[in-house]
Amino acid sequence: SPVPFGPEGRLEDKLHKPKATQTEVKPSVRFNLRTSKDPEHEGCYLSVGHSQPLEDCSFNMTAKTFFIIHGWTMSGIFENWLHKLVSALHTREKDANVVVVDWLPLAHQLYTDAVNNTRVVGHSIARMLDWLQEKDDFSLGNVHLIGYSLGAHVAGYAGNFVKGTVGRITGLDPAGPMFEGADIHKRLSPDDADFVDVLHTYTRSFGLSIGIQMPVGHIDIYPNGGDFQPGCGLNDVLGSIAYGTITEVVKCEHERAVHLFVDSLVNQDKPSFAFQCTDSNRFKKGICLSCRKNRCNSIGYNAKKMRNKRNSKMYLKTRAGMPFRVYHYQMKIHVFSYKNMGEIEPTFYVTLYGTNADSQTLPLEIVERIEQNATNTFLVYTEEDLGDLLKIQLTWEGASQSWYNLWKEFRSYLSQPRNPGRELNIRRIRVKSGETQRKLTFCTEDPENTSISPGRELWFRKCRDGWRMKNETSPTVELP
């Protein structure tokens, strides 16, 4: 398991205790050309200076060449994500060369020792690439290094040491411990390839962050904020708590980066889009759903090459499993007055009705607080494609629906028993689709009735395309 404690380790083992007993460790790296989707097919081992295996195994000099680089291991055997990735690459790029970099002898050690071995493995890969470059028609521009966890930093070293520049490096949740804040030449960084894209799925601001938090590529994508991945909660992963430990949650979140990448290969008709944003909180507010000036991109294999002057942090929401794609909507709700709000924030839900489908009831996450006489922005997302939106139902949850709110209501009543009814006035909701970049305005069905109070709902119908009011101009929108 390429996490510093895997499904077969315990949390307290963390970085120190190797699960494996070593009878012999030789500094050795093997290059296994996977010639079939079949995981049981043995493939061919390539070695520098030996051209025969290239011919015997039909290495295609003009095609794309993928190097898959695993991370730290506690078992000395490849985890199943690796053959899923091999199979997906073969499915998507039928003529490509898919090479698995086997550095198990150097990875099946104490985590700290495995980290210290990443440099030598990077050197081995660079030597292999330098040798391949001596062959006619082989181009470094066609090389794509894909590294998971510790393997992402190995890819960085390889890109740094090779003569020339590799086409692309994809870092799949690059390892955090011993790399967070490290010097640019001691970790994956944007200068290691022509294009470096990174998926971060297990970052933590508290405790041990298995994945690196800092941006290390040209684009750094943080699905679901880069931390808590849907479908990876204790209940989701274990089915029954009796059968597992917190380490399975760790594995689920860390490995999610691989599965998002696999998804981008096999479900290219359902691409997931990420949106540039300064931080996760702003994204959760729905502020960052723009595609202008390269502010959005596909994630995974389909990512468009972007070489920004500085790191570009991008965010998206995902489903709990493949296909991971969701549909993002920015909702701008202008609250033009409210009455007797008291100390509690309202709990709002929306249901979106479209030409293809209707959404479930979706919560509006209030990141800070509802502002009066201001436009409040929210992010909502749906798992299904609703088509063109037709109407919106906005519901204010009644106090009795939440025990916490009920208690606050009761306390509020004790302090001012004659507190009259709480009420908000909303005339319109502006909606922008992240995926289509289309903007729509929804107005209350009854222009005379714009108020909403706890336990009540308000209906909005599409009243115009775009957000333009009188004297407003519409910006040009670039579709993703």
Epitope: T23, E24, S28, E40, G76, N80
Partner: antibody
Framework: QVQLVQSGAEVKKPGASVKVSCKAS????????IHWVRQAPGQGLEWMGH????????NNNEKFKDRVTMTRDTSISTAYMELSRLRSDDTAVYYC?????????????WGQGTTVTVSS | DIQMTQSPSSLSASVGDRVTITCRAS??????LNWYQQKPGKAPKLLIS???KLHSGVPSRFSGSGSGTDFTLTISSLQREDFATYYC?????????FGQGTKLEIK
């Protein structure tokens, strides 16, 4: 053709150790992993652990903790499993099995089994 | 550890019968399920890998199906040589675990 040939039956006293060998032929020994699985009389199959012959890295089932040691000699394509501090409930048939490079790979070829009897 | 539960534990059938053995995992094993056949005094033999992939040399009357946590091994028309004990095994997570076995006997 792929073959795994194990050493002969053993009778041991409680507290002693036993070392079982498994000689591989018909394939490249270092390209697959060797696993050890045991079967107590009238019981099911129990995975004990594995060795990666390429470099000798091992991983054991927690149940056997420090009692099992797996080694290999690549020059003669042979894997070994030593079980120490034997108890009567270690009486079983011990199998070596070949497995591919992934967790998911099946045990595609098995040795004939070595009967180990632990009795005072 | 992932628990693998087979049912039935034993089963009597006649030559020519269609037989189904089920295997349930305590959690999702992503279709990483293998089936083995074992005859008395012999080592197990691989029948099916990855839920449904027939191992070379195994007759086509054997088939496997299922997903997630529930899997089945089917013998479409039982032959005399099929009377044996059958085991399922998960390859999703360490430690690798086997079902307790299903003994298939002649009726």
């Amino acid at each position: 053709q792929v073959q795994l040939v194990q050493s002969g039956a053993e009778v041991k006293k409680p507290g002693a150790s036993v070392k079982v060998s498994c000689k591989a032929s018909g394939y490249t020994f270092t390209d697959n992993t060797i696993h050890w699985v045991r079967q107590a009389p009238g019981q099911g199959l129990e995975w004990m652990g594995h060795i990666n012959p390429y470099y000798g890295g091992t991983n054991n089932n927690e149940k056997f903790k420090d009692r099992v040691t797996m080694t290999r000699d690549t020059s003669i394509s042979t894997a070994y499993m030593e079980l120490s501090r034997l108890r009567s409930d270690d009486t079983a048939v011990y199998y070596c099995a070949r497995k591919g490079i992934y967790y998911s790979s099946p045990f595609d070829y098995w040795g004939q089994g070595t009967t180990v009897t632990v009795s005072s | 550890d992932i628990q693998m539960t087979q049912s039935p534990s034993s089963l009597s059938a006649s030559v020519g019968d269609r037989v189904t053995i089920t295997c349930r995992a305590s959690q999702d094993i992503n279709n990483y399920l293998n089936w083995y056949q074992q005859k008395p005094g012999k080592a197990p033999k691989l029948l099916i890998s990855y839920t449904s992939k027939l191992h070379s040399g195994v007759p086509s009357r054997f088939s496997g199906s299922g997903s997630g946590t529930d899997f089945t091994l089917t013998i479409s028309s039982l032959q005399r040589e099929d009377f044996a004990t059958y085991y399922c095994q998960q390859g999703n997570t360490l430690p690798f675990t086997f079902g307790q076995g299903t003994k298939l006997e002649i009726k």
